[in-house]
């Protein structure tokens, strides 16, 4: 029987979201509760680690929200962005595989604001390579498991 | 051994992006540099050609951006759209499989604007059929390989 | 030979879209015309029913649009949202797997407005579980088959 195809679906752990508005790496994710799950991949130090060479479909869904009860925004002009990055242990450099997002004007005229980003793509990943998620304005992240998550599943071997 | 499953991940070649704000077909894509790759499919004349019947997952990520240093926009009200189309050589007509996008108001009050679209879906494709990408406002495309790309991978055979 | 992998791609049936601006479940979808298709899954009562345990990639693309010829919007501040939900017959409760969308300001200064949402993710589904789509502002849905659709395809078995 073929070795089970690796996959992961990781959902945001909002207990430890950074406070800045700059681009930060999100290191706290669930891998074993609710919709979150992982098989034949490893989650460590905020990174999804590839254990098996292959071509994988990677995806991320990132939701941002603001309610006026959370306080006044420091600026109404926001860059709400996600970057899906790959790091190789052998060559300690980070490369962005996918990016998405939007500039938004979240004015005080509305009491609630929301915006979601979805990205996905097909990439060759080698054992030991690491996938991580960077976002801007992390304190605006929606902490629900259906809102902010990323994942991967292996589609085929490398020839 | 089963024939290796076809796939492609094509990234924008920004050296030849059309000007204008109308809907145009994007014909310049990389297939063999950086994240771009192709196997058991063909890229020719700006189209991704299917070589093997099957059900494929198709996806596209299209990023638009504008910085005030690029000059004034002709209009601040924009339609930023993508259309993933299928053409059959046998029946020379084009059909839109997927579309996405947004109307945007990119005012001069902000020096930078950004917006990304992601679409994806599962389609039956026959050998010889061609997939192409049309966008509005091509001069606003983000030329990075992590920003503007499309792809496909075969999931299963046709019964 | 392995049982053929289940899949579905369902496109909106706009002849029966609810009115109103509240969150509603969309029950009318095509499964056998145009791009719409289904295999080893069942579509019944507005829900996509799983017939085979497994890990599936689920996706949805939802487009909203408004033209001034359709009349004035009741409010220019809109929440345009999609929720992909899973219901288990054994435990009659509904859980949101994925959500996406945006708050939008669709002012009367522009004659046409458009916005699309895309979500996708990898989930364990058991036979008998049902997938459905809820949206806000259903009367603003784009009725084209390339615009508003959802689907699923099985990627691997459950160990």
């Amino acid at each position: 029987k073929l070795e089970a195809q690796p996959f992961a679906h990781l959902t945001i752990n909002a207990t430890d979201i950074p406070s800045g508005s700059h681009k930060v790496s999100l290191s706290s994710w669930y891998h074993d509760r609710g919709w979150a799950k992982i098989s034949n991949m490893t989650f460590s130090n905020g990174k999804l680690i590839v254990n098996q060479d292959g071509f994988y479909y990677l995806y991320a869904n990132i939701c941002f929200r603001h309610h006026e009860t959370s306080g006044d925004l420091a600026t109404e002009y926001l860059q709400l962005m996600v970057y899906v990055t790959k790091t190789s242990i052998k060559i300690p450099s980070s490369h962005t595989l996918m990016k998405g997002g939007s500039t938004k004007y979240w004015s005080g005229n509305s009491e609630f604001h929301f915006y979601s980003i979805n990205v996905g793509g097909f990439f060759k990943l080698r054992s030991g390579e690491e996938i991580s998620i960077e976002v801007s304005n992390p304190s605006l992240l929606d902490p629900d498991q259906d809102a902010t998550y990323f994942g991967a599943f292996k589609v085929r071997d490398i020839d | 051994k089963l024939e290796a499953q076809p796939f492609a991940h094509l990234t924008i070649n920004a050296t030849d992006i059309p000007s204008g704000s109308h809907k145009v077909s994007l014909s310049s894509w990389y297939h063999d540099r950086g994240w771009a790759k192709i196997s058991n499919m063909t890229f020719s004349n700006g189209k991704l050609i299917v070589n093997q019947d099957g059900f494929y997952y198709l996806y596209a990520n299209i990023c638009f951006r504008h910085h005030e240093t690029s000059g004034d926009l002709a209009t601040e009200y924009l339609q930023l759209m993508v259309y993933v189309t299928k053409t059959s050589i046998k029946i020379p007509s084009s059909h839109t499989l997927m579309k996405g996008g947004s109307t945007k108001y990119w005012s001069g009050n902000s020096e930078f604007h950004f917006y990304s679209i992601n679409v994806g879906g599962f389609f039956k494709l026959r050998s010889g059929e061609e997939i192409s990408i049309e966008v509005s406002n091509p001069s606003l495309l983000d030329p990075d390989q992590d920003a503007t790309y499309f792809g496909a991978f075969k999931v299963r055979d046709i019964d | 030979k392995l049982e053929a992998q289940p899949f579905a791609h369902l496109t909106i049936n706009a002849t029966d879209i609810p009115s109103g601006s509240h969150k509603v479940s969309l029950s009318s979808w095509y499964h056998d015309r145009g791009w719409a298709k289904i295999s080893n899954m069942t579509f019944s009562n507005g829900k996509l029913i799983v017939n085979q345990d497994g890990f599936y990639y689920l996706y949805a693309n939802i487009c909203f649009r408004h033209h001034e010829t359709s009349g004035d919007l009741a409010t220019e501040y809109l929440q345009l949202m999609v929720y992909v939900t899973k219901t288990s017959i054994k435990i009659p409760s509904s859980h949101t797997l994925m959500k996406g969308g945006s708050t939008k300001y669709w002012s009367g200064n522009s004659e046409f407005h458009f916005y699309s949402i895309n979500v996708g993710g990898f989930f364990k589904l058991r036979s008998g579980e049902e997938i459905s789509i809820e949206v806000s502002n259903p009367s603003l849905l784009d009725p084209d088959q390339d615009a508003t659709y959802f689907g699923a395809f099985k990627v691997r078995d459950i160990d």
Epitope: H22, G71, A74, T75, Y77, S139, L140 | - | -
Partner: antibody
Framework: QVQLVESGGGVVHPGRSLRLSCAAS????????MHWVRQAPGKGLEWVAV????????YYADSVKGRFTISRDNSKDTLYLQMNSLRPEDTAVYYC????????WGYGMDVWGQGTTVTVS | DIQMTQSPSTLSASVGDRVTITCRAS??????LAWYQQKPGKAPKLLIY???SLESGVPSRFSGSGSGTEFTLTISSLQPDDFATYYC?????????FGQGTKVEIK
Amino acid sequence: QVQLVESGGGVVHPGRSLRLSCAASGFTFSGYGMHWVRQAPGKGLEWVAVISYDGTNKYYADSVKGRFTISRDNSKDTLYLQMNSLRPEDTAVYYCAKCLSGTYWGYGMDVWGQGTTVTVS
Amino acid sequence: DIQMTQSPSTLSASVGDRVTITCRASQSISSWLAWYQQKPGKAPKLLIYKASSLESGVPSRFSGSGSGTEFTLTISSLQPDDFATYYCQQYNSYSWTFGQGTKVEIK
């Protein structure tokens, strides 16, 4: 470690100008709003001005409005306070302080410099 | 502008005492209140933000409560290091103001 260092203080005659600087290190400066707060000799703290992380929004106390200008250079990790038309009542120790939240106002100031003294006489 | 009034202005206490400082706002500020500690010749130090959230690294003997117009800072058991001046600071509609301060001194 996280640090803010003010400079540019000194003795100046009324009506003259002075520019204070605040050099940041140990955190992503471009991700946080920054304040200037002052303290006259033997008195309490008085808020002076604030600037958002991207520099788009600036707010001032009524006592300095029209005379003081807050600015920042994110490429140099530096905050500035341009003080014009100085008055004797502007005499104080001037502190720069980092916003606890980069996204929201109102969460307090979690990192402070050691202060720089401005004397107007 | 919103005025912040602290009481008392001076408080004499002993090590081990439970100490409470009050801050009143001239109009509602929801929970947008912070508390600071300042020692002579030093910069202020953030203790509490959003009325009741303890800043990282601050001892748990410090706590904050209140909302609207009335707020309190409580030190459950006064330690030698706690003798200092304490300031409340409000935020409301793009304006920040401090209270006049409360000096906690040794009895």
